[in-house]
Structure formats: structure tokens, C-alpha cells
Interface confidence: medium
């Protein structure tokens, strides 16, 4: 059954800079990935990046660099400066649209005990919405 994992890491070199990595564990072909913060996209969250396998990538501040890592995983680096910068307890969500199954979403945040540069392993997070 499809699942989504989310990993959040604070960069050791820039303490207010975050890297979010998300992956899809499923057999369907990915049509779209949406990364948001503050909650699920469409349910109070704010979109940070949209990645489409063919149409390209769009990102919005404070997102600095969104990219595909593999055919089924992405990473997003966030700038840490300014009023819109994330804090340690910010929730980040990734939604994978997989054809033809539908939409699979999971959220994660920085592990409470993690030191800069460290993070929890990328384990599957709870799926919030799926079809």
C-alpha cells in the first residue's frame, strides 16, 4: 500500500536553514509533489514548492532550492532569514499525487531532541489523506 515519508533536518552551518526530504513508497507513477508548511496543503498550510516530473518545479519564499532526488523522492532547502523563516516546531507536509491511485500526504517536523545537522531516519510518517 502506498506510503509517504518525511524527514526534516536543521543544517549545522546555518541554524535557521532547513532541509526537507520526502519520498513515496508505492508503485504508481508520480504526477505531482506539493510541499507545504504549517499544515497540509489546502487545509491551512502554505505551499512552498510544487514539483512536476515533466512541467518542472515552482517554489516560493522561503524555499531556496527544490529538486528531485530520485524518481520517487524530493528535497527542499529553506532559507532561514526573515519573518517568514521556519522555527524548530514547524510542521512540513508532502503530498504525492500518484497515478491512478490519487493523493498521498504525510507531515513531519524537526525531532525535538535533534542537534543541528542531525535528524531522525526517514521513516514513514502518518498519512493524512489518501485515495
Amino acid at each position: 500500500t502506498p506510503e509517504v515519508w518525511v524527514q526534516v533536518r536543521m543544517e549545522a552551518t546555518e541554524l535557521s536553514s532547513f532541509t526537507i526530504r520526502c519520498g513515496f513508497l508505492g508503485s504508481g507513477s508520480i504526477s505531482l509533489v506539493t510541499v507545504s508548511w504549517g499544515g497540509p496543503n489546502g487545509a491551512g498550510g502554505t505551499t512552498l514548492a510544487v514539483l512536476h516530473p515533466e512541467r518542472g518545479i515552482r517554489q516560493w519564499a522561503p524555499a531556496r532550492q527544490a529538486r528531485w532526488e530520485t524518481q520517487s523522492s524530493i528535497s527542499l532547502i529553506l532559507e532561514g532569514s526573515g519573518a517568514s523563516s521556519p522555527c524548530a516546531n514547524t510542521t512540513f507536509c508532502c503530498k504525492f499525487a500518484s497515478f491512478p491511485e490519487g493523493s498521498w500526504e504525510a507531515c513531519g517536523s524537526l525531532p525535538p531532541s535533534s542537534d543541528p545537522g542531525l535528524s531522525a531516519p526517514p521513516t514513514p510518517a502518518p498519512i493524512l489523506r489518501a485515495d
Partner: antibody
Framework: EVQLVQSGAEVKKPGASVKVSCKAS????????IYWVRQAPGQGLEWMGT????????SYNQKFRGRVTMTRDTSTSTVYMELSSLRSEDTAVYYC???????????????WGQGTLVTVSS | QIVLTQSPATLSLSPGERATLSCSAG?????MHWFQQKPGQAPRLLIY???NLASGVPARFSGSGSGTDYTLTISSLEPEDFAVYYC?????????FGQGTKLEIK
């Protein structure tokens, strides 16, 4: 107003093919997938397959693989479902449904065609 | 494929009563969706992703469950609720529907 309008009823002989159309209006055609469901008389619902209208990807129920073909014409916002090698047990009402929008969080099937009755009889 | 078994096949109740419809999956699914169908009409989505009310669906409908066991509940039946109800899974291909529960007036 969002609408899916399907072609009219068909009577076919065993071994023939049928092509049912589903014309969409009232929304951006390529934003949504279309899926097809059929319902034999007095029976339940059966998923036949899904087509991604933006890039023509298809996913078929293995039960129909080799017999079903789903296509789309973006110029007319129409999706087609063709079923070949018809047999009597293919007699059913065939529905198209609007399935998924990439900019909305949840993939809800919220609009359906009115259904097309296909009768297979010798 | 994942077989969905709905129970009961027929449920006879009176308006104002509470209806509980069950859907059991042959193997675990992440979410269940529920459709209502009236004679001569296309199906209508009621509940998506187990517990989310589709647009325009009255609040008397609710869904719950996880794993292999899912439930659709109608808290107080209205005359227009008497119809056939189908569950559907989209966790595994091919997508499958239950055989339906017919909710009839007692």
C-alpha cells in the same frame, strides 16, 4: 456549471466493439483525470480504468486489459472508452467520472456522466 | 485484488432511525470511500478518505474505520436516504467496490 455528457445508448452484436464518449465542460479539462465505471443490470459497480487527461497516461483494470482502450481529445474536451470483443456479459451502463485535480488536496470523484447503456445481444 | 464485503446486504429501517453499514476488506487498505446510488441515477460520492464528507453531503452521514473494517453511519434517516450504498478502496489496483448494501424503508 461542470458537466460530463455521455453518448447515447448502443446495441451491439457479440464480437463487435463499442466506443463511448464523455464530453466535459465547465472546468479545465486537463486538470482532472477521468475514470470509467460500469454497472451490469441489477449488479454493483466495477472500475474499468482511469486516464490522465493531461498526458494521456492510462491505468486499466486487468480484467479488461487488451479489450479496453481509453483515449482523450483535448481539442474537444472529450474522453473515449472503447471496449472490443464484446460479449453478453458486457451489457451494462457505463459511467465516466471526473476524478482528480492536481491543485486541490483531495482526489474526490465529484461529477459523473449520466451513463450510457450498452446492450450486447445477438 | 482486494475483495470488499458489505453487510448487511439489505437493511430495513424507518425514518429517524440510525443506520450502520459495514464494509470489510479482504486485506488491509489505507482508506475507504462511500457512494450512494438511487435507481436510474449515477453514484454520488458521500464520504472520501474514510471520514471526510464530500461537498453538499449532510452532516448526518459519517464514516470511520481502519485496516480491514470500515463503517458508514447515518445518524437519523431521512426519506431521501433510502438507496444503495457502496464502499470503494483505492489503495491497491484494481480499485474495487463492495457489492452494495440496500437501505430500504421498513
Amino acid at each position: 456549471e461542470v458537466q460530463l455528457v455521455q453518448s447515447g445508448a448502443e446495441v451491439k452484436k457479440p464480437g463487435a466493439s463499442v466506443k463511448v464518449s464523455c464530453k466535459a465542460s465547465g472546468y479545465t479539462f486537463t486538470d482532472y483525470w477521468i475514470y470509467w465505471v460500469r454497472q451490469a443490470p441489477g449488479q454493483g459497480l466495477e472500475w474499468m480504468g482511469t486516464i490522465d487527461t493531461s498526458d494521456h497516461k492510462t491505468s486499466y483494470n486487468q480484467k479488461f486489459r487488451g479489450r479496453v482502450t481509453m483515449t482523450r481529445d483535448t481539442s474537444t474536451s472529450t474522453v473515449y472508452m472503447e471496449l472490443s470483443s464484446l460479449r453478453s456479459e458486457d451489457t451494462a451502463v457505463y459511467y465516466c467520472a471526473r476524478d482528480f485535480i492536481i491543485t486541490v488536496n483531495y482526489p474526490v470523484v465529484d461529477y459523473w456522466g449520466q451513463g450510457t447503456l450498452v446492450t450486447v445481444s445477438s | 485484488q482486494i475483495v470488499l464485503t458489505q453487510s448487511p446486504a439489505t437493511l430495513s429501517l424507518s425514518p429517524g432511525e440510525r443506520a450502520t453499514l459495514s464494509c470489510s476488506a479482504g486485506s488491509s487498505v489505507n482508506y475507504m470511500h462511500w457512494f450512494q446510488q438511487k435507481p436510474g441515477q449515477a453514484p454520488r460520492l458521500l464520504i472520501y478518505s474514510t471520514s471526510n464528507l464530500a461537498s453538499g453531503v449532510p452532516a448526518r452521514f459519517s464514516g470511520s474505520g481502519s485496516g480491514t473494517d470500515y463503517t458508514l453511519t447515518i445518524s437519523s434517516l431521512e426519506p431521501e436516504d433510502f438507496a444503495v450504498y457502496y464502499c470503494q478502496q483505492r489503495s491497491s489496483l484494481p480499485f474495487t467496490f463492495g457489492q452494495g448494501t440496500k437501505l430500504e424503508i421498513k
